[in-house]
Interface confidence: medium
């Protein structure tokens, strides 16, 4: 069962309940397990149980994590996958989701995906399936690994609400974030906007409405006047470094 479910959004005011058949696991209705976080009206409610979060796809993990087996060769076919910390710049990767926000996977290395680095028409990154071993992450876990080949196919960047696979598909000021069962371009958060801070591993779960990260020069921190509030209702906002 899922360890946690988190529902949040950039703009969604009417959040469906985290259960009620809205989301599920393969072959079953979703069931709440310990560690549920549910954001409604900017209040977080949490139940304590911080275990590594099992996942089936990258989108179930936080924006600073990806889904894979915990250690090389630790899991065979059908082995448990968990959310692992993203890889920083210049670290080895096999797909975009492995790289931390602001980076993408190019030639097996996490590179900055700064919009200024791309020509106006943006380089399309074709996804190819690669079943080879990922020597820096999990190998032999039975799941296809994605890597990229860059081909100079120029296209317009996705506007807000456009379908996307990764943030580099979106126009400047937007990121690619989960929205129900797909991903769309959403605005990068501005100063003062509510953000999602995954403080501890396993505390987030599937973000049905995923927020973008804070914009340049901003960090997701507890809002000052919320310091006195209990752990379960601390509000995070994008603030200047």
């Amino acid at each position: 069962t899922l360890n946690s479910v988190l529902i949040n959004s950039n703009a969604i005011k009417n959040l469906p309940p985290p259960l009620g058949g809205a989301g599920g696991q393969p072959g079953s209705a979703v069931s709440v397990a310990p560690g549920v976080l549910y954001e409604g009206g900017n209040k977080y409610q949490t139940l304590d149980n911080y275990q590594p979060y099992p996942c089936a796809e990258d989108e179930e993990c936080g924006s600073d994590e990806y889904c894979s087996s915990p250690s090389r060769g630790a899991a065979g076919v059908g082995g448990v996958q968990i959310c692992l910390a993203c890889r920083k710049r210049r670290k080895r990767c096999m797909r975009h989701a492995m790289c931390c926000p602001g980076n993408y996977c190019k030639n097996g290395i996490c590179m900055p995906s700064d919009h200024s680095h791309f020509p106006r028409g943006e380089i399309e990154e074709s996804i190819i399936e690669n079943l080879g071993n990922d020597h820096n992450a999990a190998a032999g876990d039975g799941y296809p690994r994605r890597t990229t080949l860059t081909s100079k196919i120029y296209h317009t960047k996705g506007q807000e609400g456009s379908v996307c696979l990764r943030s580099s598909d979106c126009a400047a000021g937007l990121c690619c974030a989960r929205h129900f069962w797909s991903k769309i371009c959403k605005p990068v958060l501005k100063e003062g906007q509510v953000c999602t801070k995954h403080k501890r591993k396993g505390s987030h779960g599937l973000e049905i409405f995923q927020r973008c990260y804070c914009g340049e020069g901003l960090a997701c921190r507890i809002q000052k006047d919320h310091h006195q509030a209990s752990n379960s209702s601390r509000l995070h906002t994008c603030q200047r470094h």
């Epitope: 979703v30 089936a56 807000e160 797909s182």
Partner: antibody, heavy 114, light 107 residues
Amino acid sequence: QVQLVESGGGLVQPGGSLRLSCAASGFTFSSYGMSWVRQAPGKGLEWVSGISGSGSYTYYADSVKGRFTISRDNSKNTLYLQMNSLRAEDTAVYYCARHYMDHWGQGTLVTVSS
Amino acid sequence: DIQMTQSPSSLSASVGDRVTITCRASQDISNYLHWYQQKPGKAPKLLIYGASNLQSGVPSRFSGSGSGTDFTLTISSLQPEDFAVYYCQQYDSIPMTFGQGTKVEIK
């Protein structure tokens, strides 16, 4: 180009079952969420169900919850809708669609009648 | 559930006319709104996504505007192939819901 082709529709008695299929091509199927949408004869559009790219997460309209099951086989680039306990009001053209309906199939007609 | 109300339910217009269709959501849906065109016996075709973005391959005479609860689809100069039914659809929350449709007929 993106292509979605539905099949499996037909005439079925109330209480019966039917399984719809949607064959996808022209895009990386496993990377996209998919939906089923239906349209009763002469009526408007109704979203039925959605599923994430890996198939791990599913979503249903209240009108079909507990009776319909959405699934996918990414190795076959195919989306499914298993429909059980069918009712007369389920009669409609069923469309499969990519993402939030940015591309649609041509539809398959399901008629529930005795 | 979010109710989507389109107006008018039908309209008659001539080729070259400027046509405006409105869609109102029962609650704030930000810009999570699509506009579709559907012709008889065909699947709907996405025209506008994210309330105001033109889908690739759609003629520029189509435009969308609005945010929150009130949205508009405008056809700047109606062409013969534009006579069809138009639907709005919100994707802000589950269940995703459509407007009842606006039929654009030849005057």
